[in-house]
């Protein structure tokens, strides 16, 4: 599941990973677009296993997965999965 | 390529107000984070303001806030600085930018327009 | 906020030295740093990202690193365009902050 956050909190990912992440490991993708007290857009993968990892949104493979996702959501549902969180 | 044009710069009295505009082309404006970084005669650069592409979240360094304000109509693809109760230490070349996706660092820069504030 | 301060000031290099210029950060900031170049009444032009990416544009000889508080622009071998003023600029957190400029002069 992919989700787009818009929070008031400030940046939430004080370091980022570039190292690749199966998909099999991933729980859900949180992205949080730049705003909201951050000045850079965040990415933070939500594990299987209850770990949190901040990824680089330059990575290649991060890219990739969420254009998959969001081809695959658009393709079966009338709207894409992005759940919005407003405060 | 990407353009950036700025206008608006002159000579204004101590007090006053001035807006600066700038005019982007050549990329999505309305999908493009914008900011002013200002200059001031021998001294260093400045960051002023940022806006985002919808014009929803705004930034502003603590020495201009609340007497600029920084807008923009994405339809005219216009960048807009609005200075109220100008001073001296406002006198500064003012640069119009367009940020790289996802970060707050200048990827492109407009020429910049003069602003001196003088009695 | 976070202060940025940049040392030397003022730098005399010759054509062809390897020149470093320095940042230093008042708190952590990860990699989260930009450098630019700005000649004498022209706009600033971006050079690195992220502390060691080096922007669209920009030539290979300038090189970024550090992490955290520290972090260096280095010019491989002076060349004659290179001449100009060089900002840091933090991107961690609001406000964004400038260092205050190192002048690279011609020795």
């Known amino acids: 599941v992919l989700e787009v956050y818009y929070t008031s909190l400030r940046c939430r990912c004080v370091q980022e990973s570039s190292v690749f992440i199966p998909r099999r490991f991933i729980d859900r993708i949180q992205i949080l677009p730049r705003g909201n007290g951050c000045p850079r857009k965040e990415i933070i993968v939500w594990k299987k296993n209850k770990s949190i990892v901040c990824v680089d949104p330059q990575a290649e493979w991060i890219q990739r997965m969420m254009e998959v996702l969001r081809k695959r959501s658009s393709s079966t549902l009338p709207v894409p999965v992005f759940k919005r969180k407003i405060p | 390529q990407v353009q950036l044009v700025e206008s608006g710069g002159g000579l204004v009295q101590p007090g006053r107000s001035l807006r600066l505009s700038c005019v982007g082309s050549?990329?999505?404006?309305?999908?493009?984070?914008m900011s002013w970084v200002r200059h001031a005669p021998g001294k260093g650069l400045e960051w002023v303001s940022a806006i985002s592409g919808s014009g929803g979240s705004t930034y502003y360094a603590d020495s201009v806030k609340g007497r600029f304000t920084i807008s923009r109509d994405n339809s005219k693809n216009t960048l807009y600085l609005q200075m109220n109760s100008l001073g001296a230490e406002d006198t500064a070349v003012y640069y119009c930018?367009?940020?790289?996706?996802?970060?707050?660092?200048?990827?492109?820069w407009g020429r910049g327009t003069l602003v001196t504030v003088s009695s | 906020d976070t202060q940025m301060t940049q040392s030397p000031s003022t730098l005399s290099a010759s054509i062809g030295d390897r020149v470093t210029i320095t940042c230093r950060a008042s708190?952590?900031?990860?990699?989260?740093l930009a450098w630019y170049q700005q000649k004498p009444g022209k706009a600033p032009k971006l050079l690195i990202y992220?502390?060691?990416s080096l922007a669209s544009g920009a030539p290979s000889r300038f090189s970024g690193s550090g992490s955290g508080t520290d972090f260096t622009l280095t010019i491989s071998s002076l060349q004659p365009d290179d001449f100009a003023t060089y900002y840091c600029?933090?991107?961690?957190?609001?406000?964004?902050?400038f260092g205050g400029g190192t002048k690279l002069e011609i020795k």
């Open positions: 708190e952590g900031i990860y990699h989260w």
């Open positions: 930018t367009r940020d790289l996706p996802g970060i707050a660092v200048a990827g492109y």
């Open positions: 050549g990329f999505t404006f309305g999908n493009s984070w």
């Open positions: 600029q933090q991107y961690s957190n609001y406000p964004l902050t």
């Open positions: 992220k502390a060691s």
